[in-house]
């Protein structure tokens, strides 16, 4: 066929129509052609590109009894739930023998109420703290103008006059609702309503007021909480774990924390039942009727040392002439700190008391003055830490040494000539 005669020879007797509608619409485009001989497969084009995954059906009706007679071929393209990506120019394409034929175009357009691409989301914010909300809508038809509403009250005089995609809120002191309206030539669509819950601000200046071996007193400054009074504050303490280390931003402690509630005011709390001479991390959050604030950062604190809670154990004292042999074991009761040593005191019936610092040894040999005839000699031992002396043991009488008894080998400790302190009994 001559190169310029294609249009006249077109087999198409029905071209696609036009569809214009709102999102979600279902519609059908239809092509009809009349051909001689075997009917061809009809392909659909959108904006000049073959649709690889077209929802199309093809019906073929013979107009005669012979296979070489004419056929009517109808192809229908179904568009389900119309979207912006479906819009464009549609045509049918067929290959007949060695020739290509394209139908006249039809158009699919989208026109309706604005469609939200982004809507404001529920969120929590600290009182008097700035934040942003987002809203985005599109047509067609364009333009789409937005109007923000706070607690159902418009924030601008007319659509398009106030903030558009992003609304900056400098801060709230009460829980509020926000929505946005999208306006175009077809009408108005309203977004979901976002609830912005106002929580107390994070407490500030968490600090230690006083320390004792088993308790810490802490205080803090509450943050603003809007129109909602604080109902209580919650303090958490956790044993510091050198292996893990609680970083300032770490969301959760490495073990189950000790939790205490404080009624407010005052913004102060005494934490008891702690271990002495132990590092802790503490944090605080305050709660109103709307919910809790965020936690403060973890604050490292430490309980101070205490004195040992019990005397040394299993004290034995034996005498052999002018020498006395004393030994003992570490207290079973908590030391409440680092053991620095032991103090030992002994006294005879009519002699002054003698106090000695033994250091960390748990046995000592005493060189008694005179011929060793001092009667009713008794010995007491106490453990001590940096915080001071623990309780003294009950007086232990010095027993005569019997052959076969073990005897510690230690340098002799000479008895000082003057008493150093008054007796604990």
């Amino acid at each position: 066929a001559p190169r310029g005669t294609q249009a006249e020879e077109s087999p198409f007797v029905g071209n696609p129509g036009n569809i214009t509608g709102a999102r979600g619409l279902t519609g059908t485009l239809r092509c009809q052609l009349q051909v001689q001989g075997e009917p061809p497969e009809v392909h659909w084009l959108r904006d000049g590109q073959i649709l690889e995954l077209a929802d199309s059906t093809q019906t073929q009706v013979p107009l005669g009894e012979d296979e070489q007679d004419d056929w009517i071929v109808v192809s229908q393209l179904r568009i389900t739930s119309l979207q912006l990506s479906d819009t464009g120019q549609y045509q049918c394409l067929v290959f007949l023998g060695h020739q290509t034929f394209v139908s006249q175009p039809g158009y699919v357009g989208l026109e309706g109420l604005p469609y939200f691409l982004e809507e404001p989301e529920d969120r929590t914010v600290a009182a008097n703290t700035p934040f942003n909300l987002s809203c985005q809508a599109q047509g067609p038809p364009e333009p789409v103008d937005l109007l923000w509403l706070q607690d159902a009250v418009p924030l601008a005089t007319a659509p398009g006059h106030g903030p558009q995609r992003s609304l900056h809120v400098p801060g709230l002191n009460k829980t509020s609702s926000f929505s946005c309206e999208a306006h175009n030539a077809k009408g108005v669509t309203t977004s979901r309503t976002a609830t912005i819950t106002v929580l107390p601000q994070q407490p500030r200046n968490l600090h230690l007021v006083s320390r004792q071996p088993t308790e810490l007193e802490v205080a803090w400054t509450p943050g603003l909480s809007g129109i909602y009074p604080l109902t209580h504050c919650t303090l958490q303490a956790v044993l510091s774990d050198d292996g893990m280390g609680i970083q300032a931003g770490e969301p959760d402690p490495p073990e189950e924390p000790l939790t205490s509630q404080a009624s407010v005011p005052p913004h102060q709390l005494r934490l008891g039942s702690l271990h002495p001479h132990t590092p802790y991390h503490i944090r605080v959050a305050c709660t109103s009727s709307q919910g809790p604030s965020s936690w403060t950062h973890w604050l490292p604190v430490e309980t101070p040392e205490g004195v040992p809670l019990g005397p040394p154990e299993n004290i034995s004292a034996t005498r052999n002439g002018s020498q006395a042999f004393v030994h003992w074991q570490e207290p079973r009761a908590p030391l409440q700190g680092t053991l620095l040593g032991y103090r030992l005191a002994y006294q005879g019936q009519d002699t002054p008391e003698v106090l000695m610092d033994i250091g960390l040894r748990q046995e000592v040999t005493l060189e008694l003055q005179g011929d060793g005839s001092v009667s009713n000699l008794t010995v007491c031992v106490a453990a001590y830490t940096a915080a001071g002396d623990g309780p003294w043991s009950l007086p232990v009488p010095l027993e005569a040494w019997r052959p076969g008894q073990a005897q510690p080998v230690h340098q002799l400790v000479k008895e000082p000539s003057t008493p150093a302190f008054s007796w604990p009994w």
Epitope: R3, Q6, A7, G48, G88, Q89, F95, Q99, V102, Q104
Partner: antibody, heavy 118, light 112 residues
Framework: QVQLQQPGAELVKPGASVQLSCKAS????????INWVKQRPGQGLEWMGN????????NYNEKFKSKATLTVDKSSSTAYMQLSSLTSEDSAVYFC???????????WGQGTTLTVSS | DIVMSQSPSSLAVSAGERVTMSCKSS????????????LAWYQQKPGQSPKLLIY???TRESGVPDRFTGSGSGTDFTLTISSVQAEDLAVYYC????????FGGGTKLEIK
């Protein structure tokens, strides 16, 4: 009769821009892609890009993305290619061609000879 | 991008001889939906626009002499001129339109 008409020649100075035209007739202009092809003297054919007049959708050869801009005017059934920041390397014959979906017939314009010279 | 390679780049033959030229693509040009190979052969004479000879790899364009034959499928294609005539002096280009357009570098046919 399908025709693609192009001006025979254009003379422009280096650094300037030029808009080449391709006027279509004899068929439904909005239904077929228009392609642009460059041929430097004594060289082969280089596809530059194409445009679908129905939607103004375009594709470009990466090599010509910052050099060429394709547009159409549906009311006059004319396709345009604007070439910017011209140098002597842009001196060539530029053809427009209609793509019949990989089939027959396809039609080519006669080409516009662009000379970039001061 | 699809790359098209043509060989040889030139050849000289006497009138009446048979000539074949090759075109290879970097990926298959067979569209499984339309069941067609989107490869075309063009002839360009000096000072003229390219003229379509073959499309769909093997379909001869209307008015093209039957001494021109296209063959091949997928990635390997051949243009054969069964008996070269003096007027066949030209450059021959293959072109893929499977994905946009890409031309081969051309084969220059000279007559001895």
């Amino acid at each position: 009769q399908v025709q693609l008409q192009q001006p025979g020649a254009e003379l422009v100075k280096p650094g300037a821009s030029v808009q080449l035209s391709c006027k279509a007739s004899g068929y439904t202009f909005i239904s077929f892609w228009i392609n642009w092809v460059k041929q430097r003297p004594g060289q082969g054919l280089e596809w530059m890009g194409n445009i679908f007049p129905g939607s103004s959708s375009t594709n470009y050869n990466e090599k010509f993305k910052s050099k060429a801009t394709l547009t159409v005017d549906k009311s006059s059934s004319t396709a345009y290619m604007q070439l910017s920041s011209l140098t002597s390397e842009d001196s060539a014959v530029y053809f427009c061609a209609r793509d019949y979906y990989g089939g027959s017939p396809d039609y080519w314009g006669q080409g516009t000879t662009l000379t970039v010279s001061s | 991008d699809i790359v098209m390679s043509q060989s040889p780049s030139s050849l000289a033959v006497s009138a009446g001889e048979r000539v074949t030229m090759s075109c290879k693509s970097s990926q298959s040009l067979l569209n499984t939906r339309t069941r067609k190979n989107y490869l075309a052969w063009y002839q360009q004479k000096p000072g003229q626009s390219p003229k379509l000879l073959i499309y769909w790899a093997s379909t001869r364009e209307s008015g093209v002499p039957d001494r021109f034959t296209g063959s091949g499928s997928g990635t390997d294609f051949t243009l054969t001129i069964s008996s070269v005539q003096a007027e066949d002096l030209a450059v021959y280009y293959c072109k893929q339109s499977y994905n946009l357009w890409t031309f081969g570098g051309g084969t220059k046919l000279e007559i001895k």
